[in-house]
């Protein structure tokens, strides 16, 4: 297993609809042809992994169908969307990079993106 | 070394606008969030509101909404804090910092007046 | 919005002695999200803990956080000259984010 850098951004504010997107960006040292990402969530000392995908360079990443992430690829780039997002669900993304094939095993894994998620102020009762 | 300057002081009448800049250097601007916090002469912090510069997104203090607007120029690498309709009590050092778990970059701060 | 209390207002030590500030929460924060800041007269806060008990870059080790849910501490095991000045808690766990009033630790 050899390692490899990934970037992300240091922090994202979800948007008011509970959406986050960023860029996961990894330093290809070779032609990988098949790649895995996943997202592990950090939170109170307790690591998650909230989705994971495996793409073949140059295809779309294919998560499962009731994943709450979805992304796309360009490069050495993902671009992952995670949806859904409460306020308990803030915490720290980390993005893990597989180059799995062809050999060797390269392995990645980011610093984190910490998510802000606020919660939409309640609408005030209306009489109409 | 990161670096975070903000503009310079300034006196407005109440009612008026004020816009205070802070331009980051040193670092991936859009990589983090700022963070802006008041304090009035003698008086304890008091924390406005933030934006993500990586996205825009912004979250404000209940009782500024509607008078605060956060921006940020990525061309520039500077944010902006908008405060309208000024009355007495806006008279405080406005900082800016940079964000992520607490704010562990400030600004100089910017003393804005407000006074008739 | 979370109320954030800092106790006591003031504090008088000596150089050399322990320091234990408190901030006390009106609900129940995520340890995660509870940071404390030292403040000097005409300048700007500097971010000391992060997350309750993280230290930030290059804050010495006699500065150390604690707590959970309503009550949190940062202690200063020896007082030194440049230690005394204003400390702030601020929580960002639930929006509104708040900060507390204040302690402020004076030589005796």
């Known amino acids: 297993c050899k390692a490899m850098h990934v970037a992300q951004p240091a922090v994202v504010l979800a948007s008011s609809r509970g959406i986050a997107s960023f860029v996961c960006e990894y330093a290809s040292p070779g032609k990988a042809t098949e790649v895995r990402v996943t997202v592990l969530r950090q939170a109170d000392s307790q690591v998650t992994e909230v989705c994971a995908a495996t793409y073949m360079m140059g295809n779309e990443l294919t998560f499962l169908d009731d994943s709450i992430c979805t992304g796309t690829s360009s490069g050495n780039q993902v671009n992952l969307t995670i949806q859904g997002l409460r306020a308990m669900d803030t915490g720290l993304y980390i993005c893990k990079v597989e180059l799995m094939y062809p050999p060797p095993y390269y392995l990645g894994i980011g610093n984190g993106t910490q998510i802000y998620v606020i919660d939409p102020e309640p609408c005030p009762d209306s009489d109409f | 070394q990161v670096q975070l300057v903000q503009s310079g002081a300034e006196v407005k009448k109440p009612g008026a606008s004020v816009k205070v800049s802070c331009k980051a250097s040193?670092?991936?601007?859009?990589?983090?969030?700022i963070s802006w916090v008041r304090q009035a002469p003698g008086q304890g912090l008091e924390w406005m509101g933030w934006?993500?510069?990586?996205?825009?997104?912004?979250n404000y203090a209940q009782k500024l909404q509607g008078r605060v607007t956060m921006t940020t120029d990525t061309s520039t690498s500077t944010a902006y804090m908008e405060l309208r309709s000024l009355r007495s009590d806006d008279t405080a050092v406005y900082y800016c910092g940079r964000w992520v778990r607490g704010v562990e970059y400030w600004g100089q701060g910017t003393l804005v007046t407000v006074s008739s | 919005e979370i109320v954030l209390t800092q106790s006591p207002g003031t504090l008088s030590l000596s150089p050399g002695e322990r320091a234990t500030l408190s901030c006390r929460a009106s609900q129940s924060v995520s340890s995660s999200y509870l940071a404390w800041y030292q403040q000097k007269p005409g300048q700007a806060p500097r971010l000391l803990i992060y997350?309750?008990?993280s230290r930030a870059t290059g804050i010495p080790d006699r500065f150390s956080g604690s707590g959970s849910g309503t009550d949190f501490t940062l202690t200063i095991s020896r007082l030194e000259p440049e230690d005394f000045a204003v400390y702030h808690c601020q929580q960002y766990g639930r929006s509104p984010w708040t900060l507390g009033q204040g302690t402020k630790v004076e030589i005796k």
């Open positions: 934006i993500s510069a990586y996205n825009g997104n912004t």
């Open positions: 040193g670092y991936t601007f859009t990589s983090y969030g």
């Open positions: 997350g309750a008990s």
